[in-house]
């Protein structure tokens, strides 16, 4: 290389990361094997769980505003879960990104897209729940499935928009030990006249903006909506059912516990540009908290099912139907099996355009999902405890 050839400019923290070398010590190898196993299992669980949630909520339940939120949340989690196998592969080949720069950008973008989408959707659900209580008449007239889908599309668009910088500034960087990193390189595009200033300002801007937009603001919206609902129901002399408290605690706690540490380390990493002493802490902690954030997508479907007996019931029924249709013998085609099928498909057409994944069910409404964010679990939106409370107090 000639003396004048300018090397690929890297921020100090990134260049120092590229200098870190791998050790083949036994205890580290065991940790790596355990990590691969854990992430592999999480990948499988996440894909299956979120796939099942999408199937059950999208095809086995009457479509409501609530099921719309859940569908989009599950879709976001499914996307994240779909990217986990590639992260598992990265771990399996010794923490080296062997899948190229384009896929590095795409893979990382999915992580951030899920981060923003989850935060935005949780905010929307809590605001929706708040509107139902605070503005019941308006909600009655304007809360439609179509409107919810439109809101979700807007939120997805916003999430994509917020993900663009992470796509642009993601890069593959060769480490001195031969491994390849898939990481931020904020000097990748238009580094400006001063690299130090650019590194500092861009790293801080990315860390602070994602902390605010994907974490702090959604949590503030959830908290203030929860407070507004509590105040309104207390004012009406209605004590909110205990399960709402339990459910909101579960979902919001999962979001906060999974994403909180990631944002803390992300902010520490931005601070580490000016304070190199923080770098070792960041290098050690960031992989763990990133995995924890990924696992939120695996945890969510479990929360949906655990907090919703109706969901569990529909899930069991759906799985039984799927197994019956798969395990049915060819000789049974003229018998009971086919009549059961015929009956299902004929009625499904009237119930849903998705005849293949629909089944005639009494209109029970969505799962009691995401705690206080939703009005009811087993009953339809019109007859849920919240709606009953509203009708009795507003009439």
């Amino acid at each position: 290389m000639s003396a004048n050839a300018t090397l690929k400019p890297l921020c100090p923290i990134l260049e120092q990361m590229s200098r870190l070398q791998s050790h083949s010590n036994t205890s580290i190898r065991y940790i790596d094997h355990a990590a691969v196993l854990l992430h592999g299992l999480a990948s499988l669980l996440g894909l299956v769980e979120n796939g099942v949630i999408l199937f059950v909520v999208g095809c086995r339940m009457r479509q409501t505003v609530v099921t719309t939120w859940v569908l989009h949340l599950a879709l976001s989690d499914l996307l994240a879960s779909a990217s986990l196998p590639f992260f598992t592969y990265f771990l399996a080949v010794g923490h080296s990104w062997e899948l190229g720069t384009t896929f590095c950008k795409l893979h990382s973008s999915i992580f951030f897209l899920n981060m923003f989408a989850s935060g935005f959707l949780l905010s929307a659900i809590s605001l929706d729940r708040c509107l139902q209580v605070v503005r019941p008449v308006w909600a009655q007239n304007h809360r439609t499935v179509a409107a919810a889908h439109k809101v979700c599309l807007v939120l997805w668009a916003l999430a994509v928009l917020n993900t663009v910088p992470y796509f642009v500034f993601r890069d593959t960087i060769s480490r001195l030990d031969g491994r390849i990193m898939c990481y931020y390189n904020v000097l990748l595009l238009n580094p400006g006249p001063d690299r130090d200033a650019t590194c500092n300002s861009r790293q801080v801007a990315l860390a602070v903006s994602k902390f605010l937009l994907a974490f702090l603001v959604p949590l503030a919206i959830i908290a203030s909506s929860h407070a507004a609902v509590s105040l309104r129901l207390q004012h009406r002399g209605r004590r909110r059912p205990g399960r709402f408290v339990r459910l909101v605690a579960a979902v919001v706690a999962a979001f906060a516990l999974c994403w909180g540490p990631y944002h803390v380390f992300s902010l520490l990493e931005a601070r580490a540009h000016a304070n190199p002493g923080l770098r070792p802490l960041v290098w050690r902690g960031l992989p763990f908290v990133t995995s924890l954030a990924f696992f939120n997508s695996v945890a969510n479907p479990v929360l949906y099912v655990l907090t919703c007996p109706d969901m569990l019931r529909k899930l069991r029924r759906s799985l039984r139907t799927v197994l019956e249709s798969v395990l049915v013998d060819d000789s049974e085609l003229g018998g009971a099996g086919s009549s059961r099928r015929r009956r299902t498909s004929s009625t499904a057409r009237s119930a849903s355009p998705l005849a293949l994944c629909s089944r005639p069910e009494e209109p029970r409404g969505p799962a009691r999902l995401l705690g206080w964010l939703l009005g009811s679990c087993a009953a339809s939106p019109q007859t849920g405890p919240l709606n009953r409370a509203l009708s009795s107090t507003s009439s």
Partner: antibody, heavy 118, light 107 residues
């Protein structure tokens, strides 16, 4: 060919001031971080100051902080070291050095001698 | 400040000898170490960066190793032009300090 040529050294009294210059050629000066390193006669090397490629960030060791100021003029491809309140222990050969990336001095000038004596 | 301790401070060796110089940091410097060679009346010359990486134009008989706080410069077969003073320098946290130097002399 990369070249770094220091100038401005000489004899100065304690408490006096001096400004060193380093003329750079053979590379895109504005793309590189630069430093000053000194070496007292018969002694080891000591890093004195560092400046980012655009000049917005500077760093100094405690021994010179507040007395020395590093600056650069990218339009003139020149690095400077303004030395104030000079002491006898500042007597040394002062080298300007180019950073390979963020660190590691890959090219050095031939040095300029600064003598602080009454 | 991080202290860099070089050993030995001087050594005598013959052409063809294998020479090892060590540098110990007072705390972990995470591979952020460079080795320089300086001949009398000349400016230092970069030999090794990032603890193990050979700088451009440096003969392959020079090599660097180590991690954490302990680093080594090895000259596999000493040549006449290698008689000089060698310095290590860390680039972890400012101030970036140098070792006191190791003078390699002809036996």
């Amino acid at each position: 060919e990369v070249q770094l040529v220091e100038s401005g050294g000489g004899l100065v009294q304690p408490g006096g001031s001096l400004r060193l210059s380093c003329a750079a050629s053979g590379f895109t000066f504005s793309s590189y971080l630069m430093s000053w390193v000194r070496q007292a006669p018969g002694k080891g090397l000591e890093w004195v100051a560092r400046i980012s490629n655009g000049g917005s960030t500077t760093d100094y060791p405690g021994t010179v902080e507040g007395r020395f100021t590093i600056s650069r003029d990218n339009s003139k491809n020149t690095l400077y070291l303004q030395m104030n309140s000079l002491r006898a222990e500042d007597t040394a050969v002062y080298y300007c050095a180019r950073h390979r990336t963020n660190w590691d001095f890959d090219y050095w000038g031939q040095g300029t001698l600064v003598t602080v004596s009454s | 400040d991080i202290q860099m301790t070089q050993s030995p401070s001087s050594l005598s060796a013959s052409v063809g000898d294998r020479v090892t110089i060590t540098c110990r940091a007072s705390e972990n410097i995470y591979y952020n170490l460079a080795w320089y060679q300086q001949k009398p009346g000349k400016a230092p010359k970069l030999l090794i960066y990032a603890a193990t990486q050979l700088a451009d134009g440096v003969p392959s008989r020079f090599s660097g190793s180590g991690s954490g706080t302990d680093y080594t410069l090895t000259i596999s077969s000493l040549q006449p032009e290698d008689f000089a003073t060698y310095y290590c320098q860390h680039f972890w946290i400012t101030p970036w300090t140098f070792g006191q130097g190791t003078k390699v002399e002809i036996k």
